[in-house]
Each structure stands twice: as C-alpha cells, then as structure tokens.
Amino acid sequence: ESGYAQNGDLEDAELDDYSFSCYSQLEVNGSQHSLTCAFEDPDVNITNLEFEICGALVEVKCLNFRKLQEIYFIETKKFLLIGKSNICVKVGEKSLTCKKIDLTTIVKPEAPFDLSVVYREGANDFVVTFNTSHLQKKYVKVLMHDVAYRQEKDENKWTHVNLSSTKLTLLQRKLQPAAMYEIKVRSIPDHYFKGFWSEWSPSYYFRTPEINNSSGEMDPI
C-alpha cells in the first residue's frame, strides 16, 4: 500500500499544552490489544487528567484508560480496527483536546528477540538470525526489520540493513578483522498496518576472526 507520501508540510501544532501521542499493539496479550498514550510534555501536571477513547469500538461507545505513572493504558478486545476513534484528554466531563486516530495506523510491534550471530568458516560469512512474536499473530504478521550493526569502537557509525525475513547473511570481507561488533534489530509494520518502529532488541556482541596471513583469510575464533 502506498500510504501517503509527505510533502514537507508541518503537522498541526497543538493549540494547548496537552498534546499527546499514542501507539497501539495488536494481540499483545493473547487476543487482547493495547493502546498506550502519553503527553509530549513530561512536565504536564497529570493529577486530574484522564484519557478516553470513543468510536470504532465493539459493544461499547467509550472506554477509559488506566493511568500507570506517566502513561495511560488500555488493554481490551473491543477495538473494531476499522474506522477512526476519538481519543480525548479530559478533566472531569470536559474535553481539553482530542485526536481522531485510526488504531491501525499507529501500530508499534513488539521488539524482536533471540538475536544471534553464527560464523560459518567455510562460507566466510556470519549468519544473523532473530525471532519475532509477530510470526504467530493474526493481524500484524508482515514486518520490515532494521538490523543495525557497528564496530564497538565506532560510537555512532551504525550500518543498517532492511529485510523482511528473520535471517541475514553478513559477508566476512565487509567487516573489519579481529574486531568486536555490536548488532541489534527492530521492526515496523509493512502490510496494511502502519505505525512506528518497535523498541530495539537487546544487543548481541560478536568478534570477527583474525586475518590468516598465509591465505589472506580471517582466522575463526
């Protein structure tokens, strides 16, 4: 799906101090979906503020969020997943600000896990594999993954590779010999559903072999 190409216009600046952002996670707990919202400004006094979602719900008109420290949270099976919901910040019965949001456009996948790297001596390459809970899901099954790796000494020099599978091969000759590397992976929805990058997986660290002087090849570890 092409979605909407951006033309550089800035989004609406909120007219008040209560601007917020939300993300949804589908089938995050069995068949339950979740919706998490938080204020953009961490200094907002949230003491009497509540969040409410209305519309595009099954069997009910509206649902109230639970407050968990600075975030507001719903876990439910009642998202219709078609049409726009109205999410409002409320104090008592008064709405301070509202947003019309289609929950299928603000999906944040769960972070990938079990990232590992195996060196194949005969092939002179590294096979990167990881897992994602989304392989078992019924809605957000198709993801784009972003694998990022760097030499440990290069603070901000990350190399990124985008892929749709959970397996990647890194050629040994593209990496520095006898170096320690850090690698991590994150995911974003890639078919119908839209939204945000997941959190990064925990990093995995691996060392590349020395160069074998006689053959010009790297030594395995």
Epitope: E1, S2, G3, Y4, A5, Q6, N7, G8, D9, E11, D12, A56, L80, L81, I82, G83, K84, K100, D102, T104, T105, K138, Y139, Y192
Partner: antibody
Framework: QVQLVQSGAEVKKPGASVKVSCKAS????????LHWVKQAPGQGLEWIGG????????AYNQKFKGRVTMTSDRSTSTVYMELSSLRSEDTAVYYC???????????WGQGTTVTVSS | DIVLTQSPDSLAVSLGERATINCRTS??????????MHWYQQKPGQPPKLLIY???NLESGVPDRFSGSGSETDFTLTISSLQAEDVAVYYC?????????FGGGTKVEIK
C-alpha cells in the same frame, strides 16, 4: 452537518487542465483524509487518489500518477484536484469523498461534471 | 490490482422480498477478522452513499434491513425486505490494497 461542496461543471479542450475544488464543513478539516473518485458516463466508480489535509501527504492511483495533483488549503477547508493533459476518456463526474476509515468513504460531495471535447 | 466481480449485474425483486448481491474479489481482502470490504448505494443523479463498512458494520442512519457478510474473497449485501426507495445501483469496494477498487455495480429494480 457534515458537508462537501464541489465546484461547478467544466468544459475543457483535449490537452488542457482542469482544477476541481471541494470545500468541507461541519467537522474538523484535518481529522479526515479526502479522496477523489471518477465516474464516467454510465460506468462504475474509480478511485483516483487522496490527500491528508493535516500533512498534505498524498496517495495516487498509479493509473493517474503524473497527470493528477491534489492539494489542500487549511485556511479555507478546501481540497483541490488538478487533472492535466485531458483527453476524451476523462469526461466524467468527479466526486470528492471523506474517508471515514481506511479507506471507505462516508461522506460524498455532489459531484463535478467535467466534459472534454474539441 | 484487486478485481471485484459483482453478481448479478441486475436484479428484479418484489416489494417486501429479499435481495442478495454478491461480490467476489481476485484475492483476499481480509486480515484475520478485519474484512476490508464496503458497500455503497447510488441512486440516479446522486453521489454514492455508504451503507456497510468492514463487511458487516452498518453505517449510522442506514436502515437495518441492509446487512453485509462474508470474508476473504466472498461477500454479500442483503436487503431483507425491499422497499421502493431501495431501487438503485449497489457497489462493493475493497480497501486492503492501493488502488482501492470498486465492483462493476448491481442494478436493483422492483419486479
């Protein structure tokens, strides 16, 4: 009440351009995407593309890409569709329609007839 | 592009009788329980009007004699008891994949 009001009928020569407007009222303009749908005489419906008034982002049907441009003016709650290099097959009624969700159309304009004739 | 094939092309039904329109898609327009199929009614000289979204959800203000069902590639619009004002052309539309395509239409008349 929620309304989409389109500009009047147009008669154009082949090769010319036409710009049709659609003014929204009765709801917050930036809350909903607006799309354009073509209906040739006696024919069915064909999606041309849509625009998100909040960001100005557009999505076009590949068939019309390169000939269609959609813009929006938040100050007047109006969206525009410009179709260039007109040919006789472009003779049709053009509807603007609000997207109530992804991507179905819950409110429609009254339609604008565009006739392309030499 | 996803092709939507409606059947029949036209349908003549007695007042008070049931009218059934089918829409078949060239590939699935469902993601699990999310069915991205919608139905519209168009009367002569008027714009289309949304009746059903998400295969089975009745749009606000639409009489409940209209209902929708189906999943994957086969969908149905049913008018349980045809009224004179239901004479129109009915279109199905998918929204799983750009370009969002419509069926060719089914003309419903009174027998």
């Amino acid at each position: 009440q929620v309304q989409l009001v389109q500009s009047g009928a147009e008669v154009k020569k082949p090769g010319a351009s036409v710009k049709v407007s659609c003014k929204a009222s009765g709801y917050r303009f930036t809350d909903y995407e607006l799309h354009w749908v073509k209906q040739a005489p006696g024919q069915g419906l064909e999606w041309i593309g849509g625009i998100d008034p909040k960001t100005g982002g557009t999505a076009y049907n590949q068939k019309f890409k390169g000939r269609v441009t959609m813009t929006s003016d938040r100050s007047t709650s109006t969206v525009y569709m410009e179709l260039s290099s007109l040919r006789s097959e472009d003779t049709a009624v053009y509807y603007c329609a609000r997207s109530g969700g992804r991507w179905y159309f819950d409110v429609w304009g009254q339609g604008t007839t565009v006739t392309v004739s030499s | 592009d996803i092709v939507l094939t409606q059947s029949p092309d036209s349908l003549a039904v007695s007042l008070g009788e049931r009218a059934t329109i089918n829409c078949r898609t060239s590939e699935s327009v469902s993601i699990h329980l999310l069915h991205l199929m919608h139905w519209y009614q168009q009367k002569p000289g008027q714009p289309p009007k949304l009746l059903i979204y998400g295969a089975s959800n009745l749009e606000s203000g639409v009489p409940d004699r209209f209902s929708g069902s189906g999943s994957e590639t086969d969908f149905t619009l049913t008018i349980s008891s045809l009224q004179a004002e239901d004479v129109a052309v009915y279109y199905c539309q998918q929204s799983i994949k750009d370009p969002y395509t419509f069926g060719g239409g089914t003309k419903v008349e009174i027998k």
